[in-house]
């Protein structure tokens, strides 16, 4: 059994999250994850989910009673999602920490927008780029 | 030329983001994107970048002078990053809108944590799962 399982059960007790009523009104993440089988689509969704958990854990960082559980789960997330790669984790953390209300950050983001956009679609790296762009013009929602 | 280019240039003027000093102290996104060649790694990073831009655009939704530019860019982001797939975009938006301070959301998130974690590594979806779990005991990052 992975180390996170026991610690997640501990968090369930702490958050009173074991009751069946918690599942009322559908799931947060599981239903969405079920929709996406493609690895790259899953990474798009999981990126948001992982950043949510890291934010949640940050909010409880001073609560000693769950510290060990939180640290163990974070460690296992780093192993599983970032493949134990600290550079990947650090780059991710930088992105999640940028403040959208900081004027300098806003200016930089707009300054970089054209280049970011050019790299957004997987096709951006291949010769298929131009043709797929033209298809989109004619049948915008066909994908 | 893609429609977003002209509109992004318009935003650059609005945000005074065309000056060379904007590039001081390094980039926000471009340096990070340069580090990751693997498509799934790129999606992890781009997911955070795209959510940043959507948040930024939301903050300026009442500014009529850039409305057309923002809408054009958002539409092109939906084409490029979400492959024109509205369901993908909607699921993404749901994830970005969950409030980390909402008690019900917290309980649900903790309730789903074990299953979310089980799906985090790419091996989780394949027949390799059981065997890789055992390999992980010996060499956790072997996948």
């Amino acid at each position: 059994q992975d180390p996170y399982v026991k610690e997640a059960e501990n968090l369930k007790k702490y958050f009173n999250a074991g009751h069946s009523d918690v599942a009322d009104n559908g799931t947060l993440f599981l239903g969405i994850l079920k929709n996406w089988k493609e690895e790259s689509d899953r990474k798009i969704m999981q990126s948001q989910i992982v950043s949510f958990y890291f934010k949640l854990f940050k909010n409880f960082k001073d609560d000693q009673s769950i510290q060990k559980s939180v640290e163990t789960i974070k460690e296992d997330m780093n192993v599983k999602f970032f493949n134990s790669n600290k550079k990947k984790r650090d780059d991710f953390e930088k992105l999640t920490n940028y403040s959208v209300t900081d004027l300098n950050v806003q200016r930089k983001a707009i300054h970089e927008l054209i280049q970011v956009m050019a790299e957004l679609s997987p096709a951006a790296k291949t010769g298929k780029r131009k043709r797929s762009q033209m298809l989109f013009r004619g049948r915008r929602a066909s994908q | 030329q893609d429609p977003y280019v002209k509109e992004a240039e318009n935003l650059k003027k609005y945000f005074n983001a065309g000056h060379s000093d904007v590039a001081d102290n390094g980039t926000l996104f471009l340096g990070i994107l340069k580090n990751w060649k693997e498509e799934s790694d790129r999606k992890i990073m781009q997911s955070q970048i795209v959510s940043f831009y959507f948040k930024l655009f939301k903050n300026f939704k009442d500014d009529q002078s850039i409305q057309k530019s923002v809408e054009t860019i958002k539409e092109d982001m939906n084409v490029k990053f979400f492959n024109s797939n509205k369901k993908k975009r909607d699921d993404f938006e749901k994830l970005t809108n969950y409030s980390v301070t909402d008690l019900n959301v917290q309980r649900k998130a903790i309730h789903e944590l074990i299953q979310v974690m089980a799906e985090l590594s790419p091996a989780a979806k394949t027949g390799k799962r059981k065997r890789s779990q055992m390999l992980f005991r010996g060499r956790r990052a072997s996948q």
Epitope: D2, P3, Y4, E71, T72, K74, E75, D76, N78, V79, N83, S84, N85, K86, K87, K88, D90 | K34, N35, W36, K37, E38, D41, F136, R137, G138, R139, R140, A141, S142, Q143
Partner: antibody
Framework: EVQLLESGGGLVQPGGSLRLSCAAS????????MSWVRQAPGKGLEWVSA????????YYADSVKGRFTISRDNSKNTLYLQMNSLRAEDTAVYYC?????????????WGRGTTVTVSS | NFMLTQPHSVSESPGKTVTISCTRS????????VQWYQQRPGSSPTTVIF?????PSGVPDRFSGSIDTSSNSASLTISGLKTEDEADYYC??????????FGGGTKLTVL
């Protein structure tokens, strides 16, 4: 001040076993991954194994996989390396090293090393 | 698996600048952090650069690290060379499964 003190080295015959220990102090032991790195006489550094802060994740070089086992006791601030089926090519100084992060990430502090000699 | 290739030895005079390269044979040099370790004769290694270009406290700013994606290599630069810099220098990074890889080491001689 960070201190790492290795012990347990010595002379052993091929096929034999040894258990190395590394006593750590001066930092929150469970918050950092730990590694074993070795250096054969007159040769370069060779990474052997690493273990995450909780002990939940372990990593091994191909040359030792299946023969060596890394473990840690966070209550005792101690790192271990159980070495079985030893070979002549395992002869080296074995360094215990503290990593920068909770998962293997490069080392910021190294012990003085303990010498393992495998010979008949 | 990839290799990290370093020059076997380099030499330079005191006060000068020397650069030691570390070339990754496959996979991107940028996809994992690179560390540099100094090992003086008869001593344990010490870290002079971590996470591509960061210096641990106590390491003088004469030591700097960089990575170059075009040559897929990392570099350690030591300026204002001193005799005490004479040592073996090792670069280190990780493969895609996060197993640790060391370069073969470079013997720096200060003439």
């Amino acid at each position: 001040e960070v201190q790492l003190l290795e012990s347990g080295g010595g002379l052993v015959q091929p096929g034999g076993s040894l258990r190395l220990s590394c006593a750590a102090s001066g930092f929150t032991f469970s918050s950092y991954a730990m590694s074993w790195v070795r250096q054969a006489p007159g040769k370069g550094l060779e990474w052997v194994s690493a273990i995450s802060g909780s002990g939940g994740s372990t990593y091994y070089a191909d040359s030792v996989k299946g023969r060596f086992t890394i473990s840690r006791d966070n209550s005792k601030n101690t790192l271990y390396l159980q070495m079985n089926s030893l070979r002549a090519e395992d002869t080296a100084v074995y360094y215990c090293a503290k990593d920068f992060w909770v998962i293997t990430s490069g080392n910021d502090y190294w012990g003085r090393g303990t010498t393992v000699t495998v010979s008949s | 698996n990839f290799m990290l290739t370093q020059p076997h030895s380099v030499s330079e005079s005191p006060g000068k600048t020397v650069t030691i390269s570390c070339t990754r044979s496959s996979g991107s040099i940028a996809s994992n952090y690179v560390q540099w370790y100094q090992q003086r004769p008869g001593s344990s290694p010490t870290t002079v650069i971590f996470e591509d270009n960061r210096r641990p406290s106590g390491v003088p700013d004469r030591f700097s690290g960089s990575i170059d994606t075009s040559s897929n290599s990392a570099s350690l630069t030591i300026s204002g060379l001193k005799t005490e810099d004479e040592a073996d220098y090792y670069c280190q990074s990780f493969d895609s499964t996060n197993l640790v890889v060391f370069g073969g080491g470079t013997k720096l001689t200060v003439l």
